[in-house]
C-alpha cells in the first residue's frame, strides 16, 4: 500500500493523531495517539 502525508487541505482532520494518505485506497487515515480512538481520533478512552 502506497502511503504519504495528508495534504494541507486536511489540516485538523485528525483530532488526536497523525493523518496519513492511503494513496491506493483514495482515503485519509488517522493514526491515533495512545488513549484515542474513532475515525478521526475524536474519542478518548481510559
Amino acid at each position: 500500500v502506497s502511503i504519504t502525508k495528508c495534504s494541507s487541505d486536511m489540516n485538523g482532520y485528525c483530532l488526536h493523531g497523525q493523518c496519513i494518505y492511503l494513496v491506493d485506497m483514495s482515503q485519509n487515515y488517522c493514526r491515533c495517539e495512545v488513549g484515542y480512538t474513532g475515525v478521526r481520533c475524536e474519542h478518548f478512552f481510559l
Epitope: S7, D9, G12, Y13, V23, Q27, N28, V39, R40, E42
Partner: antibody, heavy 116, light 106 residues
Framework: QDQLVQSGAEVKKPGASVKVSCKAS????????IQWVRQAPGQGLEWMGR????????KYREKFEGRVTITADTSTNTAYMELSSLRSEDTAVYYC?????????WGQGTLVTVSS | RIQMTQSPSSLSASVGDRVTITCKAS??????IAWYQQKPGQAPRLLIQ???TLQPGVPSRFSGSGSGTDYTFTISSLQPEDIATYYC????????FGGGTKVEIK
C-alpha cells in the same frame, strides 16, 4: 451503499437567498469534510467552500465570503449551503462533495435558477 | 489562494490519437492533483488522484504525471467515449479547479 442526496431544484428571484441540503446515508458526516462546488451553465467547476461537521469549522473561497454559509446538522447527517443576495450569475448546479474517508464522492447536484 | 492554469481550453483529435492536457499551479502542490471527466448533464467522474493513481474501473489509456507546479494528463489512444470535458483539481491547500479542456473528435 454510501449516498449523498441533495434537495430539489429551486427558482429564486434576484436578491433572495437559497438553502440547498445534502443528506448523507451509509456513512457519518462527522468522519468527513463536506465540500460545495458549483457549475454555471456551460462553465467550469468552482469550489465554494467546505465544512468540518465534527468541529463546525468552515473555509470559504474569498469571492463568496459574507454571502455563503455552510452548516451541518450531525443529528440528521445533513449538510447545508446557503447563498444570499442572489444574482443571475448564481444560476448553476450546486454539488456537495464528501472528502476525507473517501476521495471526493459527489452528490447528484441541485439546479438553482435565479430569474426575475 | 492557489491558481490552476489548464491548457488547452479545447482540442480536436482523431480516434486513436494521443491527447495531452496540462495544468500549471501557481505554487508547489506536492502531487496533490486529481483529474475529472465530465459528460453533459452528468456529475464529474474522478479518473485519477494523487497525480497518477488511477481509480478502480478507469481504463489504463488514462494516465497522469508531474510534480512541483507542472502536471500532465494523457489519453494514450483517444476513443469515441472519451468525448467530454476534463478538469484538474488541486487539493494541496483548500481546492481549486482548472478551467477545463473540452475534447472533441476530429
Amino acid at each position: 451503499q454510501d449516498q449523498l442526496v441533495q434537495s430539489g431544484a429551486e427558482v429564486k428571484k434576484p436578491g433572495a437567498s437559497v438553502k440547498v441540503s445534502c443528506k448523507a446515508s451509509g456513512f457519518n458526516i462527522k468522519d468527513t469534510y463536506i465540500q460545495w462546488v458549483r457549475q454555471a451553465p456551460g462553465q467550469g467547476l468552482e469550489w465554494m467552500g467546505r465544512i468540518d461537521p465534527l468541529r463546525g469549522n468552515t473555509k470559504y473561497r474569498e469571492k463568496f465570503e459574507g454571502r455563503v454559509t455552510i452548516t451541518a446538522d450531525t443529528s440528521t447527517n445533513t449538510a447545508y449551503m446557503e447563498l444570499s443576495s442572489l444574482r443571475s450569475e448564481d444560476t448553476a448546479v450546486y454539488y456537495c462533495v464528501r472528502s476525507g474517508t473517501l476521495f471526493d464522492f459527489w452528490g447528484q447536484g441541485t439546479l438553482v435558477t435565479v430569474s426575475s | 489562494r492557489i491558481q490552476m492554469t489548464q491548457s488547452p481550453s479545447s482540442l480536436s483529435a482523431s480516434v486513436g490519437d494521443r491527447v495531452t492536457i496540462t495544468c500549471k499551479a501557481s505554487q508547489d502542490i506536492h502531487k496533490y492533483i486529481a483529474w475529472y471527466q465530465q459528460k453533459p448533464g452528468q456529475a464529474p467522474r474522478l479518473l485519477i488522484q494523487y497525480t497518477s493513481t488511477l481509480q478502480p474501473g478507469v481504463p489504463s489509456r488514462f494516465s497522469g504525471s508531474g510534480s512541483g507546479t507542472d502536471y500532465t494528463f494523457t489519453i494514450s489512444s483517444l476513443q469515441p467515449e472519451d468525448i467530454a470535458t476534463y478538469y484538474c483539481l488541486q487539493y494541496d491547500n483548500l481546492r481549486t479547479f482548472g478551467g477545463g479542456t473540452k475534447v472533441e473528435i476530429k
